[in-house]
Interface confidence: low
């Protein structure tokens, strides 16, 4: 039964809330094993870049994607590279830096993108039990059927950044996406080491504001990893 | 303006039912999932249970002690979001809040008294 | 019964400057760097007045502030006026069966 699912122990290392289940009796959640809880901290442990192998965007931070390190180089290998700014090259969205999209091979800032009349992709949504949904149907969200005709406030759901009014990002809330504020000077934000870190957790906060970065906060050096706080700084 | 008014609240005799409604306004409701808190008199905040929106799946969470015994639905059709609870306890007395969950809590209604009693 | 643990009460004259802790586990409140603040007057519904630690809603006052330290996590009110007056509850998230948990309130009372 439900309960007995959310109950048993098939779920025990699933962080908060993904105890639940979709609203179908007998739907079961199996856990990723390593599952990272909210804001990446449990396994943040140092600020220098490490190459991380990967084998899709997913499993990079929110400032990089996953390719193979050379041009042409050997598929097999990749790692998770530093995303794109504004006016660089790509081959899709991953490739480009929070706050833009990529737009005819070149990164362009989402906020010039005031509404799509095309979703250019189909997203499929990582809700960190190895791509499977409640029902252990892959879910596909595409926006196609109802557009947004207005910007999404705080809080609305989202299935990119475009969708949200200015000074909004789309992130992660539980297993939906919401509109939440960019990070203003001082506040805290979540510092990626790498990416298991961003495509597994179940809350995402927006990237830091303009002429901010996301750095460790200076009074909690000697905290233990579990509890630094990261917030938003000047550079 | 965002608007949550809940109702169905009354005196039930323990092992009885009822079922609480929250009429939503001033958002699009099915952009948001919604949550039940209650509050026993005198005392703190208990979260309830929770459920997403249409494209999430209709997700649904429960606290432990209300598992198996309260089911949260809503329809967005009448931007209506309900909490049937059966085999009250006692325990269950409270008021009962219908909150917006956006970011976090952000908006709630006034509450919906519930007395579990004999 | 899992909950955040609160001080039961807390006291301050106008304009001074009061900070009410709000204390958890590496489960809940220490794992996770989304706590929330609200404050209910009473016979009134809770109101959120921090999110995520430390940001603020549009249209609280900036005399709020939230910070966390490892387990703990904290609501400063700065200049504080007799409307301040209420109860505040802290929330995060827990693992295990409880998805959502507040702590037991704080009763501030302006002197």
């Known amino acids: 039964t439900l309960n007995s699912v959310l109950n048993s122990n098939a779920i025990k290392n699933l962080p908060p809330p993904l105890g639940g289940a979709a609203g179908h009796p007998g739907s079961a959640v199996s856990a990723a094993p390593g599952i990272l809880y909210p804001g990446g901290n449990k396994y943040q442990t140092i600020d220098n870049y490490q190459p991380y192998p990967c084998a899709e965007d997913e499993e990079c931070g929110t400032d990089e994607y996953c390719a193979s390190p050379t041009r042409g180089g050997d598929a097999g290998v990749q790692i998770c590279l530093a995303c794109r700014k504004r006016r660089k090259r790509c081959m899709r969205h991953a490739m480009c830096c929070p706050g833009n999209y990529c737009k005819n091979g070149i990164c362009v800032s989402s906020d010039q993108n005031h509404f799509r009349g095309e979703i250019e992709e189909t997203i499929t949504e990582s809700f960190g039990n190895d791509h499977s949904t409640l029902d252990g149907y892959s879910r596909r969200t595409t926006l196609s059927s109802k557009m947004y005709h207005t910007k999404g406030q705080e809080g609305s759901v989202c299935l990119r950044s475009s969708d949200c009014a200015s000074g909004l990002c789309c992130a992660r809330h539980f297993w939906s996406k919401i509109c939440k504020p960019v990070l203003k000077e001082g506040q805290v934000c979540t510092k990626h080491r790498r990416k298991g870190s961003h495509g597994l957790e179940i809350f995402q906060r927006c990237y830091c504001g303009e002429g901010l970065s996301c750095r460790i906060q200076k009074d909690h050096h000697q905290a233990s990893n579990s509890s630094r706080l990261h917030t938003c700084q000047r550079h | 303006q965002v608007q949550l008014v809940e109702s169905g609240g009354g005196l039930v005799q323990p092992g009885g039912s009822l079922r609480l409604s929250c009429a939503a306004s001033?958002?699009?409701?099915?952009?948001?999932?919604m949550s039940w808190v209650r509050q026993a008199p005198g005392k703190g905040l208990e979260w309830v249970s929770s459920i997403e929106h249409k494209d999430a799946g209709y997700t649904t969470w429960y606290a432990a002690g209300v598992k198996g015994r309260f089911t949260i639905s809503r329809d967005n059709s009448k931007n209506t979001l309900y909490l049937q609870m059966n085999s009250l306890r006692a325990e269950d007395t409270a008021v009962y809040y219908c909150?917006?969950?956006?970011?976090?809590?952000?908006?709630w209604g006034q509450g919906t008294l519930v007395t579990v009693s004999s | 019964d899992i909950a955040l643990t609160q001080p039961a009460s807390v006291s301050g004259s106008p304009g001074q400057s009061i900070t009410i802790s709000c204390t958890g586990t590496s489960s809940d409140l220490g794992g996770y760097n989304y706590v929330s603040w609200y404050q209910q007057h009473p016979g009134k519904a809770p109101k959120l007045m921090i999110y995520?630690?430390?940001n603020r809603p549009s249209g609280v006052s900036n005399r709020f502030s939230g910070s966390k330290s490892g387990n703990t996590a904290s609501l400063t009110i700065s200049g504080l006026q007799a409307e301040d007056e209420a109860d505040y509850y802290c929330?995060?998230?827990?693992?295990?069966?409880?998805?959502?948990?507040f702590g037991g309130g704080t009763k501030l009372t302006v002197l």
């Open positions: 001033g958002f699009t409701f099915s952009s948001y999932w």
């Open positions: 929330q995060s998230y827990a693992s295990g069966n409880t998805k959502v948990v």
């Open positions: 995520d630690v430390n």
């Open positions: 909150a917006r969950h956006g970011i976090d809590f952000d908006h």
